[in-house]
């Protein structure tokens, strides 16, 4: 951090490495919960027109797809991978792509993914073929 920028104690709005370099925040789709038509597809676009700067540099992009008897929703947010989201750990937070994984939730079908490239939660991937380690 340059000397004229104040350092603040216990501040999670800034992440620095040992050399004082500053980590950028993620750019993520951030429409909270919206109704969705994404169903029975290998991948879907979020149809979220809002790309936000995540509040904290450690946050990653998250997408949550839910289906019950009444509707399908897609949630797009930023979230800190050190904290659970919907009671689940974000295991794939370092992935450049948002690969959906099913989670057990009573009364609904629930998929969640997280990723750490800009706007990576705009394209959510359900297809098994992406679930192997893919460099890009």
């Amino acid at each position: 951090i340059p000397p004229h920028v104040q350092k603040s104690v216990n501040n999670d709005m800034i992440v620095t490495d040992n050399n004082g370099a500053v980590k950028f925040p993620q750019l993520c789709k951030f429409c909270d919960v919206r109704f969705s038509t994404c169903d029975n597809q290998k991948s879907c676009m979020s149809n979220c027109s809002i790309t936000s700067i995540c509040e904290k540099p450690q946050e990653v992009c998250v997408a949550v797809w839910r289906k019950n008897d009444e509707n399908i929703t897609l949630e797009t947010v930023c979230h800190d991978p050190k904290l659970p989201y919907h009671d689940f750990i974000l295991e794939d937070a370092a992935s450049p792509k948002c690969i959906m994984k099913e989670k057990k939730k009573p009364g609904e079908t629930f998929f969640m993914c997280s990723c750490s490239s800009d706007e990576c939660n705009d394209n959510i991937i359900f297809s098994e073929e992406y679930n192997t380690s893919n460099p890009d």
Partner: nanobody
Framework: EVQLLESGGGLVQPGGSLRLSCAAS???????RMWWVRQAPGKGLEWVS?????????YYARSVEGRFTISRDNSKNTLYLQMNSLRAEDTAVYYC?????????????????WGQGTLVTVSS
Amino acid sequence: EVQLLESGGGLVQPGGSLRLSCAASGFTFTEYRMWWVRQAPGKGLEWVSAIEPIGNRTYYARSVEGRFTISRDNSKNTLYLQMNSLRAEDTAVYYCAKQIPGRKWTANSRFDYWGQGTLVTVSS
């Protein structure tokens, strides 16, 4: 030598407007994503807005969405921030910064140079 020089700060009443400028030199302006970042007294950095080098795609923090507008003039190597409907909580030193180009997924993209900042005070 790389230089970023912010200007346009000052004292403004709540609900008022200000336009900040950042004059850039010493690097190829059109190769960099540019940012406005602010720091309120005794607080940490807050990431306010960013703009892509070409095509002028813009991004905002949720706290300023709809009130602030970032823009750039590549012919003048200048970055701008139009701030409307200002609130007391917008009081801060505003810095412009450039992001080192790199792959988008890289987790360690960094600021390599900072300006000295311009103080914005919103008070009645």
